[in-house]
Amino acid sequence: DAEFRHDSGYEVHHQKLVFFAEDVGSNKGAIIGLMVGGVVIA
């Protein structure tokens, strides 16, 4: 039997990826992060 027409079973969520670097002091280097949907994950 052929399949009846249906959409794919999942939804693609489009999110903005933002790379940032923050200076935290002259002798402490920097924090480099990756923000996904407003949450820092790295």
């Epitope: 039997d1 052929a2 399949e3 009846f4 027409r5 249906h6 959409d7 794919s8 079973g9 999942y10 939804e11």
Partner: antibody, heavy 123, light 112 residues
Framework: QVTLKESGPALVKPTQTLTLTCTLS??????????VGWIRQPPGKALEWLAH???????SYNPSLKSRLTISKDTSKNQVVLTMTNMDPVDTATYYC???????????????WGQGTTVTVSA | DVVMTQSPLSLPVTPGEPASISCRSS???????????LEWYLQKPGQSPQLLIY???NRFSGVPDRFSGSGSGTDFTLKISRVEAEDVGVYYC?????????FGQGTKLEIK
């Protein structure tokens, strides 16, 4: 509100062609994902799916009846038409149209049905 | 064709008591997109069918929470936790995964 209404002859003779119309209101068949199907129910018996048409004119038929069925749409009138050739007394039934919409935000089931139109096939 | 077999075909129930209807498909109705298009419809006397449950276990808008659907693969169940007089009619399971789409033969629920 969403409504579907079937119309067509109450009586047809054997070998004749049946033409049924489903008039839609409260939604548009031109909306992406929208579809309308036909289902019938002989007196005292179970439901049988016949055919379905989508907004983009894609069609699906019950293979056991495909040679006799044609489903089409008139988007300007917001109508779906089903024709069934070579009618026989065993085709006596109540014929329903029902809406089914594709899409991840749609339930993808027959959520609204018409009230049905009864067709008797007799000489 | 996918044959949908319901049991029982007749179901007398006392108001307030639970009820259960079984539906078995002759083959898997899992669609390639990962969804199982198993639906339940109720046809009240003299009325058109109305949607109760879609995709096995999702209640349609306005359907009382005493109705629930479950199952997977080829075995599915509709349960009514406490039957009310307004629940009388014929219940049909339906598969929308494979062409031709097919209904069960119906289960007639009546009040004792």
């Amino acid at each position: 509100q969403v409504t579907l209404k079937e119309s067509g002859p109450a009586l047809v003779k054997p070998t004749q062609t049946l033409t049924l119309t489903c008039t839609l209101s409260g939604f548009s068949l031109s909306t992406s994902g929208m579809g309308v199907g036909w289902i019938r129910q002989p007196p005292g018996k179970a439901l049988e799916w016949l055919a379905h048409i989508w907004w983009d004119d894609d069609k699906s038929y019950n293979p056991s009846l495909k040679s006799r069925l044609t489903i089409s749409k008139d988007t300007s009138k917001n109508q779906v038409v089903l024709t069934m050739t070579n009618m026989d007394p065993v085709d006596t039934a109540t014929y329903y149209c029902a809406r089914r919409q594709l899409g991840l935000r749609s339930i993808d089931a027959m959520d609204y049905w018409g009230q049905g139109t009864t067709v008797t096939v007799s000489a | 064709d996918v044959v949908m077999t319901q049991s029982p075909l007749s179901l007398p129930v006392t108001p307030g008591e639970p009820a259960s209807i079984s539906c078995r498909s002759s083959q898997s109705i899992l669609h390639s997109n990962g969804n199982t298009y198993l639906e339940w419809y109720l046809q009240k006397p003299g009325q058109s069918p109305q949607l109760l449950i879609y995709k096995v276990s999702n209640r349609f808008s306005g359907v009382p929470d005493r109705f629930s659907g479950s199952g997977s693969g080829t075995d599915f169940t509709l349960k009514i936790s406490r039957v009310e007089a307004e629940d009388v009619g014929v219940y049909y399971c339906f598969q929308g995964s494979l062409v031709p789409l097919t209904f069960g033969q119906g289960t007639k629920l009546e009040i004792k």
